[in-house]
Interface confidence: low
């Protein structure tokens, strides 16, 4: 069927349109185009005779039309009056006629729109604003954008006048935004420039900062006022109702108690004509006295005396605070505070209670601290220690012993040999000693303030012969590749050489062996099972030598990868399967079996009588050493064949 297609259907003024013919019949004589929906000679645009290829203009021809041999019609430089229907009349060679009608619409190219407003400075919560999109254009659609977003849904927003007018009722400060309008028709779309809505608002209730309302005499008062407002607010300050100054900040240096009172900030917006005020009450306090601590006992005795510390002066309705060692008071049954917190009592003082102690008086603004006080706790003497630690000496050397005991005041020392007083000194010196100097050496420490005494006795042996040494160890069961072991040769003796043997041999050279402490200590790093040997230490001097009894190191190791025996993997049906698992381990490991992943028994030997091909599969032995915390396993594949089916098979166990 003959049809006409308009390309495009919507045409912009000044552009062109092509009326494209589809399904044009064969064997034509000619055709004519008419303006309108029917064939009307008065409205013929152009005719075309195929035989002569001659185009003849009609009454409606404007000079902007071009006809093509395929009957399509191009109209150029389109004007508004071109809108409407166009009819093609086709005359076939058999003089039978056929008609088809097409149409298009013409629209103007839109100009760039602009926004007009009925109120350039609306007041918040009071005014409405109507924006209108100019110019008014027929067949145009109007759209609005706020901050480049489509209009939000709001009961305060209303579109009217075919969406050409946007009204904002009861404007708020949040309506301050960029507004644009857009005009659209089928052939063009244009957006206006932005219009910024300037909403007048405020002032809101001002805020005064800082929020602090308490000050100390002598400080500076610096208050700042701010209120949300458009245009910005003008500020005024009043103190106790009296105008002070028209500034946003109020500064008063070196305030006194007389500056206490009500401080008012007033904010004024000249455009809205509104005023708002905020009041803050400022209190100025006088400087309190510095506290100090008194004590009822300046030299308390440890574990005997109590001490009461009192914070002075006594002030009514005051909070007292305490600190020990710059920390708040620890929770302790030996620390007690009086009801008003002014007195701190230490029950049964110890040497650790020396302090320092501080008390504080809290006022409305801050805490004033006392100077620190340190307690002089009398203690001791503790059990004295005698040095050096040697107990064996050779004849002819000098004996020099020193005694020390923790004590306050420092202890007075006395030395006794075999119960007989020798001298009142901290050190005892005897030159060129002999066997006769062997005996019990007693140091006595005395605290003159507490009257307490403590003694320590040390046995000194003067002999050319050395005693039989012994070995002490810091780890009786070390784990292989993990632990270290330190052997120490006892006793410690003066001018003595220490020697070591392993399995009767002198020490091998090894980075894992280290001698220290004058060769008195032998350390084995990262012990291995090969270190499980007999260790002997020896001591010698110029006249004597002696050896210890051997100490055998018990190294925990393993389990190593287990071995399943016998090694056979093929068995005849009917044989007995007797698998034994072994893993090197100290102590002996725990054994368990898994067949094809299924747990079996916890034994070293797995026995299955009269096996069949159903017993084919993987046999896993698992070993675990609870002492080392280590585990290991191995898997063996077992194949069972029906009797006589394959030569060379094991008969089993």
């Amino acid at each position: 069927k003959l049809t006409i297609e308009s390309t495009p259907f919507n045409v912009a003024e000044g552009k062109e349109v092509l009326l494209l013919v589809h399904n044009l019949p064969q064997h034509l004589f000619g055709y004519s185009w008419y303006k309108g929906e029917r064939v009307d000679g008065n409205r013929q645009i152009i005719g075309y005779v195929i035989g002569t290829q001659q185009a003849t203009p009609g009454p409606a021809y404007s000079g902007r039309e071009i006809i093509y041999p395929n009957a399509s019609l191009l109209i150029q430089n389109i004007i508004q009056n071109d809108t409407g229907f166009y009819t093609l009349h086709v005359i076939k060679s058999d003089l039978v006629n056929e008609e088809a009608t097409g149409q298009f619409r013409v629209y103007p190219e839109l100009p760039k729109p602009s926004i007009s407003s009925n109120n350039s400075k609306p007041v918040e919560d009071k005014d409405a604003v109507a924006f209108t999109c100019e110019p008014e254009t027929q067949d145009a659609t109007y759209l609005w954008w706020v901050n480049n977003q489509s209009l939000p849904v709001s009961p305060r927003l209303q579109l009217s006048n075919g969406n050409r007018t946007l009204t904002l009722f009861n404007v708020t400060r949040n309506d301050t935004a960029s507004y644009k309008c857009e005009t659209q028709n089928p052939v063009s779309a244009r957006r206006s420039d932005s219009v910024i809505l300037n909403v007048l608002y405020g002032p809101d209730a001002p805020t005064i900062s800082p929020l602090n309302t308490s000050y100390r005499s002598g400080e500076n008062l610096n208050l700042s006022c701010h209120a949300a407002s458009n245009p910005p607010a003008q500020y005024s300050w009043f103190v106790n109702g009296t105008f002070q100054q028209s500034t946003q900040e109020l500064f008063i240096p070196n305030i006194t108690v007389n500056n206490s009172g009500s401080y008012t900030c007033q904010a004024h917006n000249s455009d809205t004509g509104l005023n708002r005020t905020t009041v803050t009450t400022i209190t100025v306090y006088a400087e309190p006295p510095k506290p100090f601590i008194t004590s009822n006992n300046s030299n308390p005795v440890e574990d005997e005396d109590a001490v009461a510390l009192t914070c002075e002066p006594e002030i009514q309705n005051t909070t007292y605070l305490w600190w020990v060692n710059n920390q708040s008071l620890p929770v302790s049954p030996r620390l007690q505070l009086s009801n008003d917190n002014r007195t701190l009592t230490l029950l049964s003082v110890t040497r650790n209670d020396v302090g320092p102690y501080e008390c504080g008086i809290q006022n409305e603004l801050s805490v004033d601290h006392s100077d620190p006080v340190i307690l002089n706790v009398l203690y001791g003497p503790d059990d004295p220690t005698i040095s050096p630690s040697y107990t064996y000496y050779r004849p002819g050397v000098n004996l020099s012993l020193s005694c020390h005991a923790a004590s306050n005041p420092p202890a007075q020392y006395s030395w006794l040999i075999d119960g007989n007083i020798q001298q009142h000194t901290q050190e005892l010196f005897i030159s060129n000693i002999t066997e006769k100097n062997s005996g019990l050496y007693t140091c006595q420490a005395n605290n003159s303030a507490s009257g307490h005494s403590r003694t320590t006795v040390k046995t000194i042996t003067v002999s050319a012969e050395l005693p039989k040494p012994s070995i002490s160890s810091n780890n009786s069961k070390p784990v292989e590749d993990k632990d270290a072991v330190a052997f120490t040769c006892e006793p410690e003796a003066q001018n003595t050489t220490y020697l070591w043997w392993v399995n009767g041999q002198s020490l091998p050279v090894s980075p894992r062996l280290q001698l220290s402490n004058g060769n008195r200590t032998l350390t084995l790093f990262n012990v291995t099972r090969n270190d499980a040997r007999a260790y002997v230490c020896g001591i010698q001097n110029s006249v004597s030598a002696n050896r210890s009894d051997p100490v055998t190191l018990d190294v925990l190791y393993g389990p190593d990868t287990p071995i399943i025996s016998p090694p056979d993997s093929s068995y005849l049906s009917g044989a007995n399967l007797n698998l034994s698992c072994h893993s090197a381990s100290n102590p002996s490991p725990q054994y368990s079996w898994r067949i094809n992943g299924i747990p079996q028994q916890h034994t070293q030997v797995l026995f299955i009588a009269k096996i069949t091909p159903n017993n084919n599969g993987t046999y896993a032995c698992f070993v675990s050493n609870l002492a080392t915390g280590r585990n290991n396993s191995i898997v063996k594949s077992i194949t069972v064949s029906a009797s006589g089916t394959s030569p060379g098979l094991s008969a089993g166990a």
Epitope: G597, P599, N631, S633
Partner: antibody
Framework: QVQLQESGPGLVRPSQTLSLTCTVS?????????WHWVRQPPGRGLEWIGY???????NYNPSLKSRVTMLVDTSKNQFSLRLSSVTAADTAVYYC?????????????WGQGSLVTVSS | DIQMTQSPSSLSASVGDRVTITCSTS?????MHWYQQKPGKAPKLLIY???NLASGVPSRFSGSGSGTDFTFTISSLQPEDIATYYC????????FGQGTKVEIK
């Protein structure tokens, strides 16, 4: 404490081979235990793939056995999974896990999982 | 192969409720283990060897059973217990139940 961390590509083409590595920290692989792979298709349950021991001994799920290879590298304290000829059905979160040695065989330590998507 | 049936597949309970999940096997197994899996996380061992509480697991979780029927119980459901729970056995090879999703009403 013992930690396991899976690593490997998150996308594998169909018919190619999926490769994942599990790095063990806080424990030496050669000290024992069995080291497992378990997977979980999106929104589905858990499926065991197999395990390897430090000595190289392996045990695989029969349904995947023909496509699975597991390796262990004790020097790097790592073990790995290779799954060949993958299809979309192999898309899953793949977990490595340690089997606890309590004779009852359960998984006491897991990696956080690695999502592998099979897609062209 | 041993078939495992875990039920229910999902449940909704209130905080403080007692929650019970069952796991049945097609033939007898020695032990059952139970895991908790929260969204986007790896499974976490809760109960091993049927009734033993894993290290650091709250005592409100427990397990019991033998043969072919095993039970997992939360004595008093807490908000942090929202998860999927799986039973697990190892016979010829390891298999898991289909999972039970636990939600709070």
């Amino acid at each position: 404490q013992v930690q396991l961390q899976e690593s490997g590509p998150g996308l594998v083409r169909p018919s190619q081979t999926l490769s994942l590595t599990c790095t063990v920290s806080g424990f030496t692989i050669s000290s024992g235990y069995s080291w497992h792979w378990v997977r979980q298709p999106p929104g589905r349950g858990l499926e065991w793939i197999g395990y390897i021991q430090y000595s190289g001994i392996t045990n695989y799920n029969p349904s995947l056995k023909s496509r699975v290879t597991m390796l262990v590298d004790t020097s790097k304290n790592q073990f790995s999974l290779r799954l060949s000829s993958v299809t979309a059905a192999d898309t899953a979160v793949y977990y490595c896990a340690r089997e606890d040695y309590d004779y009852h065989w359960y998984f006491d330590v897991w990696g956080q999982g690695s999502l592998v998507t099979v897609s062209s | 192969d041993i078939q495992m049936t875990q039920s229910p597949s999902s449940l909704s309970a209130s905080v403080g409720d007692r929650v019970t999940i069952t796991c049945s096997t097609s033939s007898s197994v020695s032990y059952m283990h139970w895991y908790q899996q929260k969204p986007g996380k790896a499974p976490k061992l809760l109960i091993y060897s049927t009734s033993n509480l894993a290290s650091g697991v709250p005592s409100r979780f427990s397990g019991s059973g033998s043969g072919t029927d095993f039970t997992f119980t939360i004595s008093s459901l807490q908000p942090e217990d929202i998860a999927t729970y799986y039973c697990h056995q190892w016979s010829s090879y390891p298999t898991f139940g289909q999972g039970t999703k636990v939600e709070i009403k």
